[in-house]
């Protein structure tokens, strides 16, 4: 048995007479032989579930579900109840109604075995019948909505009449009917005004019925019509077996360059017209088992279950259903020497499905794991300026298909043929398994005899000891110009274009910093700033060379504080900034502020405290102290 609603609403007035019928609660059957028996909870509750008093006023007919006043609720009773409502005005009280043989213990009131009946309390007597508006004569203030389980026996789930009105205003005639009801599985009996289902409902055919209840009031000569929505939701049960959309039960996949743990190798989709079990229970009750194969397969693969709600069309309306994606996933990184082909089977079981038929499917995955060879081009040739600063990125080396690699470890090394001309370093980029070539020793660049640098690039996969080699020829170009000792180590310090371009900084390939002019559009990714090379900094990503020294590109790499209008990067740096952003790496601070700010104005602001407000900068409010702006505003 279950209630057709989880909450009912009615009005209560002071001194309403004993015997006044209040409302009916309705139970629907899960099985044809069930007979409902209703029981009221012992207590009345108020605001915030406050237990107010034992219920001495309202009774229920156990067999019909009719609630009525057993004794009148007078003012003194009401004041007694109000006094216990934690100081809140008592506007609403509620009772719990239980369906026997559900738990006899009065605890949590949860649908389907319990419903709450709310009474809006009016500290006046019942109004004169002639003063009641048609809306008040027809329907409760709170619109009802109904829940009916699919595949269950039909039954009565609502009674239209407002019983207190009918009882206290017998001369007013009220008639009801359901619009949209014809051809649908609902019926409103003209005599009893009970609404019932004509037959068992099927959620997979229709999940929501948006009906309209029409009430016609006859009071003397006048006739008025009131319409309200009358929504019915059909509740699901596990009555549909899982199926393969378009009959596809097999997926084939090749594992080659993507060999990283957690890589999705292949996906098969299962469709289930049901939306139960609910999400909390789903993974426990909808099981998938990788059928035993060899040990290698069991260790290497796992199956992940990803259920998702979807909508399907049925009889002209949309109903919810579930698609289950079963992903075959790598359980570990695969060695580049691994080479095998296998078939895997996965058993999917909808354990709640009761039939007819089986709730079990078999999924098939055909997987080929191919070995990966390491190849480099026969040679590389590039140039570097004598003025290049330490950490300047001058090129990349990359084994064949390295951009596509994941889970394949390749380490690059440089072996120099001229011991005193070992200028470059190489680091492996985690993003694309390439090797980034950068200037490591500027002293060697300055030596006249180091005009051509010869290296052997070696790419190694340490797990298998497989290697690839290539020649690298680097031509050193231009004349060395001594860097000015007064120039900041970091290009990012400079706040204006002229001072930016007259200095170099760590990471600068030309020995000069570059100015990036922003677009001036509020807090933007394209903020103005000074950079060692606008190709790499800032680009919203702290790359493997930039991580070696915070002075190279604090705009991408700073973990400190950013003052002014900005959006912080994830996990560090400036994702977006307002106006011009400059940084002081040793102080672990960056500042973003409008581009047109004049020094005298800034000096003036620094004497007090500088408030960069939400209106000015579009960001969070930041208070910048004189301490923060020391050095910054002058530089």
């Amino acid at each position: 048995l279950y209630f057709s609603r989880d909450a009912y609403w009615e009005k209560l007035y002071v001194d309403q007479p004993a015997g006044t019928p209040l409302l009916y609660v309705h139970a629907l059957r899960d099985a044809p032989e069930e007979v409902p028996s209703f029981r009221l909870g012992q207590h009345l509750y108020g605001t915030y579930r406050t237990r107010l008093h034992e219920n001495n006023w309202i009774c229920i007919q156990e067999d019909t579900g009719l609630l009525y006043l057993n004794r009148s609720l007078d003012r003194s009773s009401w004041e007694k109840l109000s006094g216990r409502n934690r100081g809140f005005p008592l506007l609403t009280v509620y009772l719990k109604v239980f369906l026997s043989p559900t738990s006899l213990r009065e605890g949590e009131c949860q649908w389907p075995g319990c419903a709450r009946v709310y009474f809006s309390f009016f500290n006046t007597s019942f109004p004169a019948c002639t003063s009641l508006k048609p809306r008040e004569l027809c329907f409760p203030e709170t619109r009802p909505s109904f829940r009916i389980r699919e595949n269950r026996p039909p039954g009565t789930f609502h009674q239209f009449r407002l019983l207190p009105v009918q009882f206290l205003c017998p001369n007013i005639s009220v008639a009801y009917r359901l619009l949209e009801g014809e051809g649908l599985p609902f019926r409103c009996a003209p005599d009893s005004l009970e609404v019932s289902t004509r037959w068992a409902l099927d959620r997979e055919q229709r999940e929501k019925y948006e009906l309209v209840a029409v009430c016609t009031v006859h009071a003397g000569a006048r006739e008025e019509v009131v319409m309200v929505p009358f929504p019915v939701t059909v509740y699901d049960e596990d009555d549909s077996a899982p199926t393969f959309p378009a009959g596809v039960d097999t997926a084939s996949a090749v594992v080659e360059f993507k060999r990283k743990e957690d890589t999705v190798v292949a996906t098969l989709r299962v469709f289930d017209a049901d939306v139960v079990p609910a999400s909390g229970e789903l993974v426990r009750r909808y099981t998938s088992t990788l059928l035993p194969g060899d040990t290698w397969t069991q260790q290497t693969f796992r199956v992940e279950h990803w259920p998702n709600e979807t909508s399907v069309q049925a009889n002209g309306s949309f109903v919810r259903a579930t698609v289950h994606d079963y992903r075959l996933v790598l359980n570990r990184n695969l060695s580049i020497s691994e080479n095998r082909t296998m078939q895997l089977a996965v058993l999917v079981n909808d354990s709640d499905f009761q039939g007819p038929g089986a709730g079990v499917l078999l999924l098939h995955f055909n997987v080929s794991v191919l070995p990966v060879s390491l190849h480099l081009p026969s040679s590389y040739s590039l140039s570097v300026s004598r003025r290049a600063r330490r950490f300047a990125q001058i090129g990349k080396v990359c084994v064949e298909n390295c951009q596509a690699f994941s889970g394949i470890n390749v380490q690059y090394e440089l072996h120099s043929s001229g011991a005193n001309c070992s200028t470059l370093g190489v680091v492996t980029s985690a993003e694309d398994t390439s090797g980034i070539l950068f200037v490591n020793d500027t002293k060697a660049l300055r030596r006249p005899k180091c005009a051509e640098l010869h290296y052997m690039v070696v790419a190694t996969n340490h797990q298998t000891s497989r290697q690839a080699q290539a020649q690298l020829l680097v031509t050193v170009e231009g004349l060395y110009v001594a860097e000015e000792a007064g120039c900041p180590l970091s290009c990012a310090v400079s706040k204006r274009r002229p001072e930016c371009e007259e200095c170099g900084g760590l990471g600068s390939p030309t020995g000069r910093c570059e100015w990036r002019q922003g677009d001036g559009k509020g807090i933007t990714r394209n903020f103005s700033t000074c950079s060692p090379s606008t190709k790499t900094c800032p680009d919203g990503h702290c790359d493997v060379v930039e991580t070696q020294d915070i002075n190279i590109c604090p705009q991408d790499c700073l973990r400190g504080s950013i003052v002014g209008g900005h959006e912080p990067g994830e996990p560090r740096g400036i994702k977006a900034g307002y106006g011009t952003c400059n940084c002081f790496p040793e102080e672990e601070k960056c500042f973003c502020e409008p581009e047109d700010i004049q020094d005298p104005l800034c000096d003036e602001l620094c004497r007090e405290q500088k408030l960069i407000s939400e209106e000015d900068l579009g960001g969070e409010q930041k208070l910048i102290s004189e301490e923060d702006l020391h050095h910054h505003h002058h530089h």
Epitope: R390, A482, E484, A485, G486, C487, P488, L489, S490, V493, E502, D549, I550, N551, F584, P585, E586, E587, E588, H631, H634, H635
Partner: antibody, heavy 119, light 107 residues
Framework: QVQLVESGGGVVQPGRSLRLSCEAS????????MHWVRQAPGKGLDWVST????????YYSDSVKGRFTISRDNSKNTLYLQMNSLRAEDTAVYYC????????????WGQGTLVTVSS | DIQMTQSPSTLSASVGDRVTITCRAS??????LTWYQQKPGKAPKVLIY???TLERGVPSRFSGSGSGTEFTLTISSLQPEDFATYYC?????????FGQGTKLEIK
């Protein structure tokens, strides 16, 4: 607050060695370049040596090149000056000074330690 | 190396006077110049950096100007505590050099 404290000075004979230390506190030492500057009694200031914040680059005045070595231990927040083959003209008060990478002038100085080279 | 020449070597003045010390570089050092004040037995103290930027906490009666090869330090109204030796220092080249100093004495 920023503090630089030099130690290791004293009287030493010509040709001998001495090692000066400068202990830093009140700032993130590893982020700053450091310098040694000396001042002979009654004379002006004379730059001796510079080391980058990460120890990657060193510079020396011609008068000490090949004899003095600057070094740093960022884990101990300490700057060193190893002085070998000392001469009478190396007699001076030796100051360590801090160099913020964003501004590059010598913004904080220690109180100095006196080195006297005399037979 | 870049030579830094300061003038005068000695300067006598009274409290309230306006004084100017000059520093000349043997080649352009743009604005990479610092002015220090030193009192006997003490470490030098920064007054001005980058030729004209007043160091935090330094009284506004001190000001610096110039760029390239000619630089000046001005004290607008001498106070008793200003009598000391003043040094200019170029940090344009890694062979850092200092001026020989200007001793400011009470007249």
């Amino acid at each position: 607050q920023v503090q630089l404290v030099e130690s290791g000075g004293g009287v030493v004979q010509p040709g001998r060695s001495l090692r000066l230390s400068c202990e830093a506190s009140g700032f993130t030492f590893r982020n700053y370049g450091m310098h040694w500057v000396r001042q002979a009694p009654g004379k002006g200031l004379d730059w001796v040596s510079t080391i980058y914040y990460d120890g990657s680059d060193e510079y020396y005045s011609d008068s000490v090149k090949g004899r003095f070595t600057i070094s740093r231990d960022n884990s101990k927040n300490t700057l060193y000056l190893q002085m070998n083959s000392l001469r009478a003209e190396d007699t001076a008060v030796y100051y360590c000074a801090r160099d913020p990478p964003s501004f590059r002038y010598f913004d904080y100085w220690g109180q100095g330690t006196l080195v006297t080279v005399s037979s | 190396d870049i030579q830094m020449t300061q003038s005068p070597s000695t300067l006598s003045a009274s409290v309230g006077d306006r004084v100017t010390i000059t520093c000349r570089a043997s080649q352009s050092i743009r604005s990479w110049l610092t002015w220090y004040q030193q009192k006997p037995g003490k470490a030098p103290k920064v007054l001005i950096y980058k030729a004209s930027t007043l160091e935090r906490g330094v009284p506004s009666r001190f000001s610096g100007s110039g760029s390239g090869t000619e630089f000046t330090l001005t004290i607008s109204s001498l106070q008793p505590e200003d009598f000391a030796t003043y040094y200019c220092h170029q940090y344009s080249s890694y062979s850092y050099t200092f001026g020989q100093g200007t001793k400011l004495e009470i007249k």
